[in-house]
Interface confidence: low
């Protein structure tokens, strides 16, 4: 990622998207190393700290304000040249978030998808945003940007993600920007986890004492596999949330998690998936569906002693 012969490469760590009040490190990489460099901002709202300043290796900028949003370039020190400085680097856009209220982010057809499928992430708001930005957690490259479309008092943009591969799984957030301030972004949307399934062999799902139980009888669903999954995820058809448990190695060399559902009040179709700690958003193929039937006096809900995970917590590690 080096620049051209006489062109430094300017980058930002951890990301070009910086929350208001946060910090960002700007690094100017020039001629096989970090040298003295100067930074400048390509607009009229000059951040005063740059005037006549020379930096070494990297410059930590912050706490950032909306005035820090914009395009930056650097020049590397080149003592024997006519000007003493290299050609300007690549432009680097720093976006500052937290300047407007957050938009909403939805996944169509849903956040749980098979490898190879495409998902549309729709970012929308009643704020008349001119542009929307989509950013994946942990990625330092610039977010994707789309022009907002306005309809019935709502501005929105549809981002197409796919065909889905493990590298695209993760936690997404979107932001909006208003006219005339393209790099002063809104607060982030609530995080949305995009999970890709179908990458590893399916686990097996069984019910104790069995798939048909009396109303009020305690039921446990066991998910197991020969694969050394770290986490199992249990989903019930028609429920937005999944439950997850750490896998436990068993004497028979399988890896298993037991989901206690409590006293049976209502049946349903269940599936489970396995995943590894290193890639929490990449799941196995689904187990065969398991239909749990309740005889006697079914009611409309099933208590869950294991708290369902939030829709945005799937891609975090289980501690």
């Amino acid at each position: 990622l080096m620049g051209g012969q006489d062109k430094p490469f300017l980058s930002a760590r951890p990301s070009t998207v910086v929350p208001r009040g946060g910090h960002v490190a700007l690094q100017c990489h020039y001629r096989r190393g970090f040298n003295n460099f100067m930074l400048y901002k390509e607009d009229r709202s000059h951040v005063p700290i740059f005037h006549g300043r020379i930096f070494q290796e990297s410059f930590i900028m912050g706490p950032v304000t909306p005035a820090h949003a914009g395009t930056y370039r650097c020049r590397g020190s080149r003592p024997h040249s006519l000007t003493g400085w290299s050609a300007p680097s690549n432009p680097l856009v720093i976006m500052v978030t937290g300047n407007h209220r957050k938009p909403s982010l939805l996944a169509h057809p849903g956040p749980l998808l098979k490898s190879g499928e495409t998902v549309i992430l729709q970012c929308w708001s009643d704020v008349m945003f001119e542009h929307f930005f989509l950013h994946r957690e942990g990625i330092s490259e610039d977010p994707s940007r789309l022009v907002g479309q306005i309809h019935d008092g709502v501005s929105k943009a549809n981002f197409s993600i796919g065909p889905l591969m493990p590298v695209l799984a993760g936690t997404y957030r979107c932001y909006g920007s208003v006219p005339h301030s393209p790099y002063q972004l809104s607060a982030p949307s609530d995080p949305l986890d995009i999970v890709i399934t179908g990458l590893y062999e399916k686990p097996s799902l069984s019910a104790q004492p069995g798939p048909t139980v009396q109303a009020g009888e305690n039921v446990t669903l066991s998910c197991s596999s020969w694969s050394s999954y770290d986490i199992y995820h249990l989903s019930r058809e028609g429920e937005a949330h999944e439950r997850r448990l750490r896998a436990v190695p068993k004497v028979n060399r399988t890896f298993q998690a037991d989901f206690p559902l409590g006293p049976a009040t209502h049946g349903g179709t269940y599936r489970c998936f396995g995943s590894f700690r290193a890639l929490p958003c990449v799941w196995s193929n689904s187990s065969d569906p398991l239909l749990v039937s309740v005889t006697g006096n079914p009611s409309s809900s099933w208590p869950s002693p294991t708290e369902p995970s939030s829709k945005s917590g799937i891609c975090r590690h289980l501690h």
Partner: antibody, heavy 120, light 107 residues
Framework: QVQLVQSGAEVKKPGASVKVSCKAS????????MHWVRQAPGQGLEWIGY????????ENNRKFKDKTTMTADTSTSTAYMELSSLRSEDTAVYYC?????????????WGQGTTVTVSS | DIQMTQSPSSLSASVGDRVTITCRAS??????LAWYQQKPGKAPKLLLY???NLADGVPSRFSGSGSGTDYTLTISSLQPEDFATYYC?????????FGQGTKLEIK
Amino acid sequence: QVQLVQSGAEVKKPGASVKVSCKASGYTFTSYTMHWVRQAPGQGLEWIGYINPSSGYTENNRKFKDKTTMTADTSTSTAYMELSSLRSEDTAVYYCARLGKGLLPPFDYWGQGTTVTVSS
Amino acid sequence: DIQMTQSPSSLSASVGDRVTITCRASENIYSNLAWYQQKPGKAPKLLLYAATNLADGVPSRFSGSGSGTDYTLTISSLQPEDFATYYCQHFWGTPYTFGQGTKLEIK
């Protein structure tokens, strides 16, 4: 069906102004941005700018910033582009185009074009 | 501003030929790209959007590919009505520049 119908050809003298219209039908005018594109004789396409009819917000290509003024009349679903201080190099076909919706939207509908000739 | 460089600028081919036109952006445009066909005296007509998606009513012999900075329009088997000028256009922030065009002529 969606239609964008533009005003007829114009012949103007250098220094004059001209106002080109683009009447939209078949969709909700305020729900889509309207863009203008220029094509000089024998040349390629150049994006001039756009107007958001619901807010009146406009954005111009810097090249045309002092040349064009874009407006919209929501009561008649008509977008306008006025070209001022005309010169011979402004001779071109001017198109209006609607920016679509959905996945990475393109210009999905175009007007038939309005020829503006600047000649003394 | 983002520059769009189309190649070739002109191309002679015969009915039935497979033809490829390329478009290179001066920076990553993340598939925010459309292709248009224009015939003399007519407005441009949308062929593909989002780099690879066929617009309504466009024959399947047209296809698009690419990502990042490099994109391609392919016509798998040229028909007489395909002889026209083709333009790419990016939507990665304003100004939405077009390629300079590729004129496809009958050999």
